[in-house]
């Protein structure tokens, strides 16, 4: 469909509330340091302009693309160069290069302080101005997560508002709010990581990589739907995510709504698990579909070998309709294996493809590919064994101990990576234990490997900004589906030149005593990484002793009447002790 005014079309489709929310998210994701009030002003101006276009699509500038309109707004900010430096250089470019330039300046690790929820102050804000409260939430999440899936953020903002509607009436606001906010925070962080991986797969590996990922995932979730149906959804979903990852948030939200409508209209041929989703309002409906439970497998599934090994036309199909044939294979394999991770399914499809590529050029192809399914077993065994070993380690050490074991493992593999990144990534990798190890056997593999893909993507995104390790670059860029096996296979870096011992790194102050438990852990884990960078060959025993002594030293000083004086006296002694243990 062609419209005279794209902005008017989107405004009419989305309605004023969602339109304003999405425009706010778009500006917040691009200008991550601007104060909220500045963004509100921009949103107001864009909304007023959109309304004039709705009234008269032929009005001046209404025919301009949304990229042009948004870009012009950004470039009109007087303090752009002062606050954003070379982002202002983008303004010298024409569309579409200007928009590409803005996208490249998105910062995945902005220097923005962590949000600390204060229940009393938040309830006061909520009760004073609900609309502003909703907008502020969108702004704070969007600026910290510049690739957050915009329509999904609108959903979380509704949930956030609901939490406050309930808890601000409660006698003990904090007791009601804090656990709910924490639970929501975890969901939001997972959602951010999932979307970041989707955007990375589209941007770094192309649309086909994303389509393959989606095909496997949807085939697992909707095994009753036929290949043609799944393919249609995959194509539409790829368009939605391409738009959101590209900053086309209005189009993305509009297309996502259309896709939810299509899925609900055709739920009979897609899945039996969508009924309750489809009765919900738009944002909840889309969220519910995305999180829908796996449907039961059809009872009459035939052995895969019929179609993909025994059939005489395998090579004909492979040569004449390669992508469709491999897609059919991935669909059929995935719907039969809800227990496998998406990455594992894609690795299996890659092996199948490589085998056909080789065999179909040979004299007797069927004899050559007859045993192709036997090649899949080692691919399945590798992550299964790894998960078994790591879950046993997690059970033995607990979450904090398991995180420390991973800090040691990863610092030895890639010691060049910055200390904050190593701590963040290893801590997140360590959470796989509590997330997945308690799950039933048939859920463990997909839970663990799909979660690890999210965390390793975070490492890749951060490392790309300031590359310091060839090993990390290699694992991140060679193959999306083999990232996890690539990192697992890395051995300690024997070429690394140890860092000089810097006493300041191991200087602690009284503030350590009042920190929340997780921040205390981060301080200790930061010291552990620095220790390993100084002594990469430190033994497990030495590290355990140092950590034990550190805990005792902190406990002693935090129990002393004058914390700071104790740290000043005991700190230097502790440093001497460390050096002695590691000598």
């Amino acid at each position: 469909d062609t419209y005279k005014s794209e902005i008017a079309h989107r405004f009419k489709d989305l309605g004023e509330q969602y339109f304003k929310g999405l425009v706010l998210i778009a500006f917040s994701q691009h200008l991550q340091q601007c104060p909220y009030e500045e963004h509100v002003k921009l949103v107001r101006e864009v909304t007023e302009f959109a309304k004039t276009c709705v009234a008269d699509e032929s009005a001046e500038n209404c025919d301009k693309s949304i990229h042009t309109l948004f870009g012009d707004k950004l470039c009109a900010i007087p303090s752009l160069r002062e606050h954003y430096g070379d982002l202002a250089d983008c303004c010298e470019k024409e569309e579409p290069e200007r928009n590409e330039c803005f996208l490249q300046h998105k910062n995945d690790n902005p220097d923005i302080p962590k949000l600390k929820p204060d229940p009393v102050a938040l309830c006061a804000d909520f009760q004073e101005d609900e609309q502003k409260f909703w907008g502020k939430y969108l702004y704070e999440i969007a600026r910290r997560h510049p690739y957050f899936y915009a329509p999904e953020l609108l959903y979380y903002a509704i949930i956030y508002k609901d939490v406050f509607s309930e808890c601000c009436q409660a006698a003990d606001k904090a007791a009601c709010l804090l656990p709910k906010i924490e639970h929501l925070r975890e969901k939001v962080l997972t959602s951010a990581a999932k979307q970041r991986l989707k955007c990375a797969s589209i941007q770094k590996f192309g649309e086909r990589a994303f389509k393959a990922w989606s095909l496997a995932r949807l085939s697992q979730r909707f095994p009753k739907a036929d290949f043609t149906e799944i393919s249609k959804i995959v194509t539409d979903l790829a368009k939605v995510h391409k738009e959101c990852c590209h900053g086309d948030l209005l189009e993305c939200a509009d297309d996502r709504a259309d896709l939810a409508k299509y899925i609900c209209e055709n739920q009979d041929t897609i899945s039996t698990k969508l009924k309750e989703c489809c009765d919900k309002p738009l944002l909840e409906k889309s969220h519910c579909i995305a999180e829908a439970k796996r449907d039961e497998l059809p009872a009459d599934l035939n052995p895969l070998e019929h179609d993909f090994v025994e059939d005489k036309e395998v090579c004909k199909n492979y040569k004449e309709a390669k992508h469709v044939f491999l897609g059919t294979f991935l669909y059929e394999y995935s719907r039969r294996h809800p227990d496998y991770s998406v990455s594992l399914l894609l690795r299996i499809a890659k092996i199948y493809e490589a085998t056909l590529e080789d065999c179909c050029a040979k004299e007797d192809p069927p004899a050559c590919y007859a045993t192709v399914f036997d090649k899949f077993q080692p691919l399945v065994d590798e992550p299964k064994n790894l998960i078994k070993q790591n879950c046993e380690l997690f059970e033995k050490l607990g979450e904090y101990g398991f995180q420390n074991a991973l800090i040691v493992r990863y610092t030895k593999k890639v010691p060049q990576v910055s200390t904050p990144t190593l701590v963040e990534v290893a801590r997140k990798l360590g959470l796989v234990g509590s997330r997945c190890c308690k799950r039933p056997e048939e859920e463990r593999l997909s839970c663990a490997e799909d979660y690890l893909s999210l965390v390793l993507n975070r490492l890749c995104v951060l490392h790309e900004k300031t590359p310091v390790s060839e090993k990390v670059t290699k694992c991140c860029t060679e193959s999306l589906v083999n990232r996890r096996p690539c990192f697992s296979a890395l051995t300690p870096d024997e070429t690394y030149k140890p860092k000089e011992f810097v006493e300041g790194t191991f200087t602690f102050h009284a503030d350590l005593c009042t920190l929340p438990e997780d921040e205390k852990q981060i301080k200790k884990q930061t010291a552990l990484v620095e220790l390993l960078k100084h002594k990469p060959h430190a033994t497990e025993e030495q590290l355990r002793t140092v950590l034990g002594n550190f805990a005792a030293f902190v406990q002693k000083c935090c129990a002393a009447p004058d914390h700071e004086a104790c740290f000043a006296v005991e700190g230097p002694k502790f440093v001497i002790e460390i050096r002695g243990i590691l000598a």
């Epitope: 036929d226 290949f227 395998v314 199909n317 004449e320 309709a321 469709v324 059919t328």
Partner: nanobody, 126 residues
């Protein structure tokens, strides 16, 4: 529910020609993998020819290659089998079969096709 209805069978002399038709309802024939099978008295049902859905790939059993041609008319939602140089061993009941939601003929196994017509008899005899 997909329904298939064959027509065009009959008695023909060796070396002669026949054109079978299969009218489909309940599915778009251009989006569905469709095939012709045949069953001679006392024998198993065997694959004759097939055509992919959404991808124009045709498939033939070795015994009919060069003699039979499978095609479809999307506007009429109909599948055809043009049979030339017919032989007595081509005598059988010919069935049209569909595997909706499948773009390719990835199998010649009759059991994997959920939808079948009632068949049309072709007799090749002098």
């Amino acid at each position: 529910e997909v329904q298939l209805l064959e027509s065009g069978g009959g008695l023909v002399q060796p070396g002669g020609s026949l054109r079978l038709s299969c009218a489909a309802s309940g599915a778009y024939i251009d989006e569905t993998a469709v095939a012709w099978f045949r069953q001679a008295p006392g024998k198993e049902r065997e694959f004759v020819a097939g055509i992919g859905g959404g991808v124009d790939i045709t498939y033939y059993a070795d015994s009919v290659k060069g003699r039979f041609t499978i095609s479809r008319d999307n506007s009429k939602n109909t599948l055809y089998l043009q049979m030339n140089s017919l032989r007595p061993e081509d005598t059988a009941v010919y069935y049209c079969a569909a595997r909706p939601g499948r773009p390719l003929i990835t199998s010649k196994v009759a059991d994997l096709y959920p939808y079948w017509g009632q068949g049309t008899l072709v007799t090749v005899s002098s």
